[in-house]
Amino acid sequence: MSRSNRQKEYKCGDLVFAKMKGYPHWPARIDEMPEAAVKSTANKYQVFFFGTHETAFLGPKDLFPYEESKEKFGKPNKRKGFSEGLWEIENNPTVKASGYQSSQKKSCVEEPEPEPEAAEGDGDKKGNAEGSSDEEGKLVIDEPAKEKNEKGALKRRAGDLLEDSPKRPKEAENPEGEEKEAATLEVERPLPMEVEKNSTPSEPGSGRGPPQEEEEEEDEEEEATKEDAEAPGIRDHESL
């Protein structure tokens, strides 16, 4: 990817891959333009992450146009929520987090949702975003999925998501499905500066952990190990 791309200006609804430290380039949507009046977010776009439904403020250097970058960044990744994000950016690009509320910042203009997009094909797949989400969840650390010898163990695909035997005990879940798992497995860490903390928990994560791959960028490996193979706000759903 050329450096010049990093200075690109984006508009509401643009589909991108967004880069946060410790995470792979993630399918995302520009939900708000930079607010010059607010120093902390000047020159930063509010980005909605597909799959996890988290938001963060990122500068243009951390954003990459989706269509141009999907060959490079759109490969399966072990992070929970990533694969579902790839589906959403293609098929449901205007998806909003549950409990969506319009932000009072400079948010995108609401327009009618398009028909479902083709999964593959001729290019203009950009949906018009329908505002930004105030709903964000805390970042959590969870244990990575264990490799297994059985066939398809690394292919956590629809129809093969539930384990036959539990890997660890699970407590009762709350009505919206945000599981509270064993305390030792849910260790909170400070939120990155750009991520807005909000009391509403995030949506459940992807139903499939894709084939495990090494991170593309070497400088992330240590961070990824510390932070674990999870996306923001996502918990392991392979524990059944």
């Epitope: 959403e88 999964a119 094909g121 629809a158 919206e176 459940p204 139903g207 059944l240």
Partner: antibody, heavy 120, light 104 residues
């Protein structure tokens, strides 16, 4: 635009083998993450999943029908074929094919369905 | 096999009503649940995926919730075009549909 269309006989006799073809466009079964499933629906009854084939030839079958079902794909023709042996009148149903991603999301795109009647 | 049980099997409602359809799985399906709408003579349409996420083009009066084994689909204000049969479907272990709820 994604489209799927089922084709095959409308009438089969008991004990015969049913062969149905799903011809699709707008996606490729050589693309990572893509699958095609067959679902059927007897008249006035519920949907029943039959089989799924993934881009990497990893297949899944309904356990109660597994011994009678075979699902195959011809990537170059954009087709998926389902064969069902030893047909019985209770197999009379509308048979649908649908596209699925392994990204753990639903059957977002369906064919129009084809009604297959099993009768002597 | 995971069994899916919907209730009620059929229900009558008036336009503008708030309608809720329930779906129970025979084991915890960890939110791996979709909802479909089917009108007579037509193929089903995906409404909600992963328990609560609205599929593209689906009106916001539809919503889904639940966890563990119990899930529900709610139509906040019933419209004429919502008259159909609704199916839940789990995809945690293979795929299984509920028996359907006919909305009249």
């Amino acid at each position: 635009q994604i489209t799927l269309k089922e084709s095959g006989p409308t009438l089969v006799k008991p004990t015969q083998t049913l062969t149905l073809t799903c011809t699709f466009s707008g996606f490729s079964l050589s693309t990572s993450g893509i699958g095609v499933a067959w679902i059927r629906q007897p008249p006035g009854k519920a949907l029943e999943w039959l089989a799924t084939i993934w881009w990497d030839d990893d297949n899944r079958y309904n356990p109660s029908l597994k011994s009678r079902l075979t699902i195959t794909k011809d990537t170059s023709k954009n087709q998926v074929v389902l064969t069902m042996t030893n047909m019985d009148p209770v197999d009379t149903a509308t048979y649908y094919c649908a596209q699925i991603y392994d990204y753990a999301v639903g059957f977002a795109y369906w064919g129009q369905g084809t009604l297959v009647t099993v009768s002597s | 096999d995971i069994q899916m049980t919907q209730s009620p099997s059929s229900l009558s409602a008036s336009l503008g009503d708030r309608v809720t359809i329930s779906c129970r799985a025979s084991q915890d399906i960890s939110n791996y649940l979709n909802w479909y709408q089917q009108k007579p003579g037509k193929a089903p349409k995906l409404l909600i995926y992963y328990t609560s996420r609205l599929h593209s083009g689906v009106p916001s009066r539809f919503s889904g919730s639940g966890s563990g084994t119990d899930y529900s689909l709610t139509i906040s204000s019933l419209q004429p075009e919502d008259i159909a049969t609704y199916y839940c479907q789990q995809y945690g272990k293979l795929w299984t549909f509920g028996q359907g709820t006919k909305l009249e």
